[in-house]
């Protein structure tokens, strides 16, 4: 039977969501509870390490939300953004693979605000490279496992 | 070793983004620089030609952005849309496979506006069929390779 | 030749879209017309039944739209949401796998409004489990087959 292909589906660790409105690399994800799972890949300090060269489909879903009971939003005009970043350890460098998001005005009369971003794409990844997620306004992240997650699965070998 | 399955990840050619607010088929994509790549598929005049029958996962990520230093937006109420289109050459016809987007009011007090769309789906494609991307308001496209791209990878054969 | 892997791409049945602004499980999808197709999975009462254990990539694209000629929207502040739900029949239980959406103010001066949501993720599914789609404000759904759909394809076996 062929060796199982690498994959991961990682969900946000609600207990470790940073506060603030700055852009930040999310550093804590679950890999083994609820829908979260990982195989033939490694999770280290919030980064998803590739152990096997290949072409992978990468995806991320990031939800932001705010209820007026939490106080006011940091600014009337929010940039709610996600960046899927590839880091090469051998040659220390980081590059954005995918980005998505929207500017939002959450100063209105509504008591609840919500917005989700989804990105996905097909990338060549080498063993040792790492995938991480950066977001703006992390304090607005929705901590549910169905809301804020990212993942990867290997589709095929590199010739 | 089995033949490598077809795939493509195509990023927008920033130098060839059309101006205007009309709906247009984007005609120039990179296939061999940065994250862009192609294998066992063909790119011709902005259309992704299928060379091998199969079931493919298709995706697109389209980002729009505007900074007040670029002047005013073309309209207060924008329709920011993407359409993933399949064209059959044998019988000249075009059909929308997927669409996404949002109406936006970018006339507000913010000096920067941003919005991204992501669509994806699983489709049966035949050799000779072509996939292209139509957008509204092309002059607002984000030209970064992590922002505006589309792609496909073959998942399995047609029985 | 290996058995074809399970897949489905299901498009909304325009004739059966419920009215109202409440959250509802969409109960009628096409599986055999236009882009819709299914293989080694089963569609029953709007739920996509898994017949074969495996890791699947699941996705959904949901479009909402409103034209002023249809009358006013149910409320100024809309929650336009989608939930991809897994139901286990053996142990009757339902869990959200993915969610996405946005709060929207569609009370403005524009005569047309549109918004799309896309979600996707990689999940372990067991034979007998079912996937369904819940949305808020179903009366605002775009009934086109390129607009409102969901699907799944098996990526690999469970070891």
């Amino acid at each position: 039977k062929p060796e199982a292909q690498p994959f991961a589906h990682l969900t946000i660790n609600a207990a470790s969501i940073p506060s603030g409105s700055h852009k930040v690399t999310l550093s804590s994800w679950y890999h083994d509870r609820g829908w979260a799972k990982i195989s033939n890949m490694t999770l280290s300090n919030g980064k998803l390490r590739v152990n096997q060269d290949g072409f992978y489909y990468l995806y991320a879903n990031i939800c932001f939300r705010h209820h007026e009971t939490s106080g006011s939003v940091p600014t009337d005009y929010l940039q709610l953004m996600v960046y899927v970043v590839k880091t090469s350890i051998k040659i220390p460098s980081s590059h954005n693979l995918m980005k998505g998001g929207s500017t939002k005005n959450w100063s209105g009369n509504s008591e609840f605000h919500f917005y989700s971003i989804n990105v996905g794409g097909f990338f060549k990844l080498r063993a040792g490279e790492e995938i991480s997620i950066q977001v703006s306004n992390p304090s607005l992240l929705d901590p549910d496992q169905d809301a804020t997650y990212f993942g990867a699965f290997k589709v095929q070998d590199i010739d | 070793k089995p033949e490598a399955q077809p795939f493509a990840h195509l990023t927008i050619n920033a130098a060839s983004i059309p101006s205007g607010s009309h709906k247009v088929t984007l005609s120039s994509w990179y296939h061999d620089r940065g994250w862009a790549k192609i294998s066992n598929m063909t790119l011709s005049n902005g259309k992704l030609r299928v060379n091998q029958d199969g079931f493919y996962y298709l995706y697109a990520n389209i980002c729009f952005r505007h900074h007040e230093t670029s002047g005013s937006v073309p309209t207060d109420y924008l329709q920011l849309m993407v359409y993933v289109v399949k064209t059959s050459i044998k019988i000249p016809s075009s059909h929308n496979l997927m669409k996404g987007g949002s109406t936006k009011n970018w006339s507000g007090n913010s000096e920067f506006h941003f919005y991204s769309i992501n669509v994806g789906g699983f489709f049966k494609l035949r050799a000779g069929e072509e996939i292209s991307i139509q957008v509204s308001n092309p002059s607002l496209l984000d030209p970064d390779q992590d922002a505006t791209y589309f792609g496909a990878f073959k998942v399995q054969d047609i029985d | 030749k290996p058995e074809a892997q399970p897949f489905a791409h299901l498009t909304i049945n325009a004739a059966s879209i419920p009215s109202g602004s409440h959250k509802v499980t969409l109960s009628s999808w096409y599986h055999d017309r236009g882009w819709a197709k299914i293989s080694n999975m089963t569609l029953s009462n709007g739920k996509l039944r898994v017949n074969q254990d495996g890791f699947y990539y699941l996705y959904a694209n949901i479009c909402f739209r409103h034209h002023e000629t249809s009358g006013s929207v149910p409320t100024d502040y809309l929650q336009l949401m989608v939930y991809v739900v897994k139901t286990s029949i053996k142990i009757p239980s339902s869990h959200n796998l993915m969610k996405g959406g946005s709060t929207k103010n569609w009370s403005g001066n524009s005569e047309f409004h549109f918004y799309s949501i896309n979600v996707g993720g990689f999940f372990k599914l067991r034979a007998g489990e079912e996937i369904s789609i819940q949305v808020s404000n179903p009366s605002l759904l775009d009934p086109d087959q390129d607009a409102t759909y969901f699907g799944a394809f098996k990526v690999q076996d469970i070891d």
Partner: antibody, heavy 116, light 108 residues
């Protein structure tokens, strides 16, 4: 569905004229509209377009002297500093409904003559 | 801008006529063809380089992409006598004219 231009006629060089486009059978306010002109015995010349709620775009040669604007029921073309070279039939045309820059419904045209 | 050739062409009833349109830079498949008869406004025949507009007979055919486009009328009838124009529908930047110069088709 149809459109109709009005406001054409005789104007002296250096003058100003505003043409008006009205529609029946559809709403002008949610359709893109172009203006095109045709000098006697010559080809078609695109002037510019305007999208719903939006700012207009113009051909290079039309920038500055030509202004496209819209109300809820009309799309107007204002022409200033007219010369004899501007003598032409002026057409307004509705774009295809999906927003492409393809001109689907044309009016019969209105003749503008610039002469002393 | 769009270069259209020939400026005029004669064709016999039942014959075939071909008109070419060249864009100065790639416009993908963003091209339309129009028919105009004397005293009438133009009529959209083809858009997206090859898609027939509603109600247009299949003897009208468009092809090409990038910078080279072709318009063909086969099995020509007397009613095909008209002037035909191509129009790029890609970008409005630096446009002097979106239309080609036109081709007069004379049916013998």
């Amino acid at each position: 569905q149809s459109v109709k231009e009005s406001g054409g006629g005789l104007v002296t060089p250096g003058g100003t004229l505003t043409l008006t486009c009205t529609a029946s059978g559809f709403s002008l306010s949610n359709n893109a509209m172009s203006w095109v002109r045709q000098a006697p015995g010559k080809g078609l010349e695109w002037i510019g377009y305007i999208y719903p709620g939006g700012s207009p775009y113009y051909a290079n040669w039309a920038k500055g002297r030509f202004t496209i604007s819209r109300t809820s029921t009309t799309v107007d073309l204002k022409m200033t500093s007219l010369t004899t070279e501007d003598t032409a039939t002026y057409f307004c045309a509705r774009h295809v409904s999906d927003g492409g820059w393809y001109l689907y419904i044309w009016g019969p045209g209105t003749l503008v003559t610039v002469s002393l | 801008d769009m270069i259209q050739t020939p400026a005029s062409v004669e064709v016999a009833v039942g014959g075939t006529v071909t008109i070419n349109c060249q864009a100065s830079q790639s416009i993908g498949s963003n091209l339309a063809w129009y028919q105009q008869k004397p005293g009438q406004p133009p009529k959209l025949l083809i858009y997206g380089a090859s898609t027939l507009a509603s109600g247009v007979p299949s003897r009208f055919k468009g092809s090409g992409s990038g910078t080279q486009f072709t318009f063909t009328i086969s099995d020509v009838e007397c009613t095909a006598a008209a002037t035909y124009y191509c129009q790029q529908a890609y970008s409005i930047s630096n446009v002097d004219n979106a239309f080609g110069g036109g081709t007069e088709v004379v049916v013998k």
